[in-house]
């Protein structure tokens, strides 16, 4: 008996060939001997089966002795043994129809789980293997689960169902809803304007939801909400904003926030959350602000940074075009009795300057100038 695998919703063509290459009488029946279709001369006739409106044949092939049964919009319950009766002989074809669907929506939030469920006919014992867009293979039976979806899981999942040494392939497009970056860090000199950007890693026709930026300043004992906003069809409207600092927000995507000036009291970490309409859970992006200040008080030149710096970073004070006078893995360094000239305060990672602030030290009888 020939086995043919089909996909739910697809069209399948079951073949039936006569030895004579001409149009002769044929019938297709199901395992209950109920007639599905056949011919009367050059006319297609249909029986009382459930397939009535979905069954067809190719009249153009009859003259060549081919009498296919075409079943459109396949259903799992179409799985059956189909019998073609032609020239006093019977050809049996076993059709097995499978369906593969994602648990809920194919648009899932980062960190959520994806469950793929296989619909299969009774008595079948298929195995399933799925390959994610990043090349990860998962195997299973009736259900396959992937927990903690990541951004790289966005794209086409290719799943192969194996039964009786035959296989059928399903493709499912999954969109992982996330920000492009899980975390970002902004380095600024005191007084500079700060731009925070939160680009999304997906595009959808309509995007509606609400969001909030909570901020934990390094100097503060608790976090506070800096801004809340609504998103309607990709248009941003601010609901509430603190007075200090007074953030500004762009009206269009990507989400964009401006802090008028970087101050030590603002240095710290923020968490932007975005709740999307009809989705449980929220999108998150962490943002960090590091602020640098260089000051001269009497005979002490000081360089300080505030905010979430890595213990790997070096803080240095150097006179322009000279070797560093002081360079330490600290958040504050100083030089006593600095000589006159342009001093540079540098925050660096393995020689790469992340943040720089210059301060002019004048001869001892005058006051310092900050360029």
């Amino acid at each position: 008996k020939k086995v043919v695998l089909g996909k739910k919703g697809d069209t399948v063509e079951l073949t039936c060939t006569a030895s004579q290459k001409k149009s002769i009488q044929f019938h297709w029946k199901n395992s209950n001997q109920i007639k599905i279709l056949g011919n009367q001369g050059s006319f297609l006739t249909k029986g009382p089966s459930k397939l009535n409106d979905r069954a067809d044949s190719r009249r153009s092939l009859w003259d060549q002795g081919n009498f296919p049964l075409i079943i459109k919009n396949l259903k799992i319950e179409d799985s059956d043994t189909y019998i073609c009766e032609v020239e006093d002989q019977k050809e049996e074809v076993q059709l097995l129809v499978f369906g593969l669907t994602a648990n809920s929506d194919t648009h899932l939030l980062q960190g959520q789980s994806l469950t793929l469920t296989l619909e299969s006919p009774p008595g079948s014992s298929p195995s399933v293997q799925c390959r994610s867009p990043r090349g990860k293979n998962i195997q299973g039976g009736k259900t396959l689960s992937v927990s903690q979806l990541e951004l790289q899981d966005s794209g086409t999942w290719t799943c192969t169902v194996l039964q009786n040494q035959k296989k059928v392939e399903f493709k499912i497009d999954i969109v992982v809803l996330a920000f492009q970056k899980a975390s970002s860090i902004v380095y600024k000199k005191e007084g500079e304007q700060v731009e925070f950007s939160f680009p999304l890693a997906f595009t959808v026709e309509k995007l509606t939801g609400s969001g909030e930026l909570w901020w934990q300043a390094e100097r503060a004992s608790s976090s506070k909400s800096w801004i809340t906003f609504d998103l309607k069809n990709k248009e941003v409207s601010v609901k509430r904003v603190t007075q200090d600092p007074k953030l500004q927000m762009g009206k269009k995507l990507p989400l964009h926030l401006t802090l008028p000036q970087a101050l030590p009291q603002y240095a710290g970490s923020g968490n932007l959350t975005l709740a999307l309409e009809a989705k449980t859970g929220k999108l998150h992006q962490e943002v960090n602000l590091v602020v640098m200040r260089a000051t001269q008080l009497q005979k002490n030149l000081t360089c300080e940074v505030w905010g979430p710096t890595s213990p790997k970073l070096m803080l240095s004070l150097k006179l322009e075009n000279k070797e560093a006078k002081v360079s330490k893995r600290e958040k504050a360094v100083w030089v006593l009795n600095p000589e006159a000239g342009m001093w540079q305060c540098l925050l660096s990672d393995s020689g790469q300057v992340l943040l720089e602030s210059n301060i002019k030290v004048l001869p001892t009888w005058s006051t310092p100038v900050q360029p």
Partner: antibody, heavy 116, light 113 residues
Amino acid sequence: QVQLVQSGAEVKKPGSSVKVSCKASGGTFSNNDINWVRQAPGQGLEWMGWINPIYGSANYAQNFQGRVTITADESTSTAYMELSSLRSEDTAVYYCAADWRGFDYWGQGTLVTVSS
Amino acid sequence: DIVMTQSPDSLAVSLGERATINCKSSQSVLSSSYNKNYLAWYQQKPGQPPKLLIYWASTRASGVPDRFSGSGSGTDFTLTISSLQAEDVAVYYCQQYYDTPLTFGQGTKVEIK
């Protein structure tokens, strides 16, 4: 597990230059600072400088400033150390070492002999 | 530059006995900002590159036997081998990575008595 493989031994004349390579495998090259450390025969360890392949900018010890150039090629996961104006006291084993809070991974060392 | 000074220069200890190496830095390598001591210890055997034993003054590197331990803070540090084994014969170096240039101690040679 990062593995560092260095180029072979070199014999150089005083006043010339030497370029030693250090190829990384088995890890993300750009995640690690690459340091260069030398050891003269029977002596201790001396740090020469470092580079972070992401940034490509190097930091050198004052003793070697102007004579040493450290570079990195992310496409081949290879770091290089070039020392110029060689003198006999530069005869040493030159090591590349990765990471920053202690050098967790070391190359096998390259012996550079400076002799007329 | 921060100068690292080790003592003693060499040390002979019986198998199974405790070996203690001291390291003193010319200035503190304790970062008040991060509350970490930027100090590492290495072991070097003849013809081999050094091997990291300890970082952050007291954290054992992966795969290092627990007979090796590091202690101390600020300017004074100690490497202890609780029960010396034959394979521990080597030169031991301390190193600071708090400030550039990174500097090493002159080394301590450990032998079996």
